[in-house]
């Protein structure tokens, strides 16, 4: 079945509410050690606000003040650096806003782009120069929050150097991250100093810490992973399909309907028909005839196309592709116009015998 990304969901289903996850790079608040910092939770209609730092609940203390939608940190220290989040709980939903706090004397900046040049992952090691681990490419580590749609692949990188070559191990929520902790395990790519998790699921949410160490020292860096679950929806039908068609009597025609659905859809082709000269019954509902439906021996590809061979004037009219799943129903319609064949008398249109 064709699949689609979050972006396509939004464009194809504009009536759906946008996913309430912050996908972009979080805002960064910078403070020098000793300074005070005040951040306002940028969420509307926040009834109840809760705060976290690096995924752990944040409560007030002698330096941290939480008043309404404001977070105040007095006398900031480098330990206050990290990924913060405020969550607004409402009656129907909740929304989270992430931001970074960076308490440091020297501020670095950069983008988390895909690998184009690997040169910066290594710094030359003088063979006699023993050295504790250090980061070789902090730009690749700046994006701490990764909000990723479910089923995507996540790659966390901690490019490092040191002599002797450091070891890299990974923790999830502060504990050793073992292969058996997730279905499908994960991969480490030593030459990229990376952790790769394929086909992420909601249970993968959490904090991932790389610990890079050799006999001369240890450094670590934490990423936060949020897995954005795709909101369930009724089937999506490709715009413009089926398309209006016209043919001459005796000709052939086909209507195509492209259906996108996460949940297994049921597809039907329906023709609008007349009964006793009327298109609608006493209840105001149209008279319909099911022409084709998915059966045990019908493939998805077969059901997406409706063929009408040796067309007659009776075949003219409105055709509907209807797709339903456990969430709802979608349909698109098209018209078939039947033209007289050259040099042939016009046929008389008869009412259909079989109505449904």
């Amino acid at each position: 079945r064709p699949s689609f990304s979050l972006v396509e969901d939004t464009t194809l289903e504009p009536e759906e509410p946008p996913t309430k996850y912050q996908i972009s790079q979080p805002e960064v608040y910078v403070a020098a050690p000793g300074e005070s910092l005040e951040v306002r939770c940028l969420l509307k209609d926040a009834a109840v606000i809760s705060w976290t730092k690096d995924g752990v609940h944040l409560g007030p203390n002698n330096r941290t003040v939480l008043i309404g939608e404001y977070l105040q940190i007095k006398g900031a220290t480098p330990r206050d650096s990290g990924l913060y989040a405020c969550t607004a709980s409402r009656t129907v939903d909740s929304e989270t806003w992430y931001f970074m706090v960076n308490v440091t004397d020297a501020i670095s900046s950069g983008d988390d782009e895909d690998d184009t040049d690997g040169a910066e992952d290594f710094v030359s090691e003088n063979s006699n120069n023993k050295r504790a681990p250090y980061w070789t490419n902090t730009e690749k580590m700046e994006k701490r929050l990764h909000a990723v749609p479910a089923a995507n692949t996540v790659k966390f990188r901690c490019p490092a150097g040191g002599n002797p070559m450091p070891t890299m191990r990974w923790l999830k929520n502060g504990k050793e991250f073992k292969q058996e902790h997730r279905i499908g395990g994960y991969k480490v790519r030593n030459q990229h100093w990376s952790l790769i998790m394929e086909s992420v699921v909601p249970s993968d949410k959490g904090n991932y810490t790389c610990v890079v160490e050799n006999e001369y020292g240890s450094i670590n860096h934490t990423y936060h992973l949020d897995v954005v679950e795709r909101s369930p929806h009724r089937p999506i039908l490709q715009a413009g399909l089926p398309a209006n068609a016209s043919t001459v009597v005796g000709g052939d025609v086909e209507f195509v309907c492209k259906v996108y659905s996460d949940a297994q859809p049921h597809i039907q082709w329906i023709k609008h028909v007349e009964k006793n000269g009327s298109k609608y019954g006493p209840d105001g509902l149209p008279y319909l005839k099911v022409l084709k439906a998915a059966g045990v021996n019908t493939t998805d590809k077969e059901i997406e196309v409706l063929y009408i061979r040796n067309v007659t004037f009776e075949d003219a009219g409105e055709y509907t592709c209807l797709a339903g799943n456990s969430i709802g129903i979608s349909f698109h319609s098209a018209w078939l116009t039947v033209l007289p064949a050259p040099g042939r008398e016009k046929e008389i249109t008869a009412s259909p015998d079989y109505l449904e």
Partner: antibody
Framework: EVQLVESGGGLVQPGRSMKLSCAAS????????MAWVRQAPKKGLEWVAF????????YYRDSVEGRFIISRDNAKSTLSLQMDSLRSEDTATYYC????????????????WGPGIMVTVSS | DIQMTQSPSLLSASVGDRVTLSCKAS??????LAWYQQKLGEAPKLLIY???SLQTGIPSRFSGSGSGTDYTLTISSLQPEDVATYFC????????FGGGTKLELK
């Protein structure tokens, strides 16, 4: 077809120097980390030295650190190992190997090997 | 340093046998493990990487498994041409080979 061909081996006296070379073809040499692996007669395999795909980083096993230098010339697709202050325990067949295409999903395993060249350190 | 221990050091088996070779790391190596085959007078050849991925061109009778510290190479049906010495190697935090398992025909 990937081909790695070592040269420069032979007999050398203890304390002297020798330089091994490896000519690579059939691959995008500048994408690959490269390594030297050795095998003493009737013994197991032993990693000697590694150099990253761009030459920016190199690592050595403890017993050769400070005596051996690994280098590469990406323009000529060649790998070198300069061996100084040679010892009798350096006697081995030396293999040139690739250690993963950086720009693929490969890791640091040794995917392609040369046939090897014998280095004998003896007086 | 992480040590790699292979067992047995010598294994005799018959054609058609299912053969299992073991490799143990002194600490977790995160599946960063390769298996190599070396025939007499030849260079080693990569068989398995990432603990369980079969290198292109290697017969499907070879398979790898394991995680953490314990890894296994299995030959499902031994062929005469499989007579060789097999080495495991970790490439997590540097490179270390196991001592090797010599496989011979009964």
């Amino acid at each position: 077809e990937v081909q790695l061909v070592e040269s420069g081996g032979g007999l050398v006296q203890p304390g002297r120097s020798m330089k091994l070379s490896c000519a690579a073809s059939g691959l995008t040499f500048s994408n690959y980390g490269m390594a030297w692996v050795r095998q003493a007669p009737k013994k197991g395999l032993e990693w000697v030295a590694f150099i990253s795909h761009d030459g920016g980083s190199s690592y050595y096993r403890d017993s050769v650190e400070g005596r051996f230098i690994i280098s590469r010339d990406n323009a000529k697709s060649t790998l070198s190992l300069q061996m100084d202050s040679l010892r009798s325990e350096d006697t081995a067949t030396y293999y040139c190997t690739t250690a993963g295409d950086y720009y693929s999903d490969n890791d640091w395993y040794f995917d392609f090997w040369g046939p090897g060249i014998m280095v004998t350190v003896s007086s | 340093d992480i040590q790699m221990t292979q067992s047995p050091s010598l294994l005799s088996a018959s054609v058609g046998d299912r053969v299992t070779l073991s490799c143990k790391a002194s600490q977790s190596i995160y599946n960063s493990l390769a298996w190599y085959q070396q025939k007499l007078g030849e260079a080693p050849k990569l068989l398995i990487y990432d603990a369980d991925s079969l290198q292109t061109g290697i017969p499907s009778r070879f398979s790898g498994s394991g995680s953490g510290t314990d890894y296994t190479l299995t030959i499902s049906s031994l062929q005469p041409e499989d007579v060789a010495t097999y080495f495991c190697q970790k490439y997590y935090s540097g490179w270390t080979f196991g001592g090797g398992t010599k496989l011979e025909l009964k």
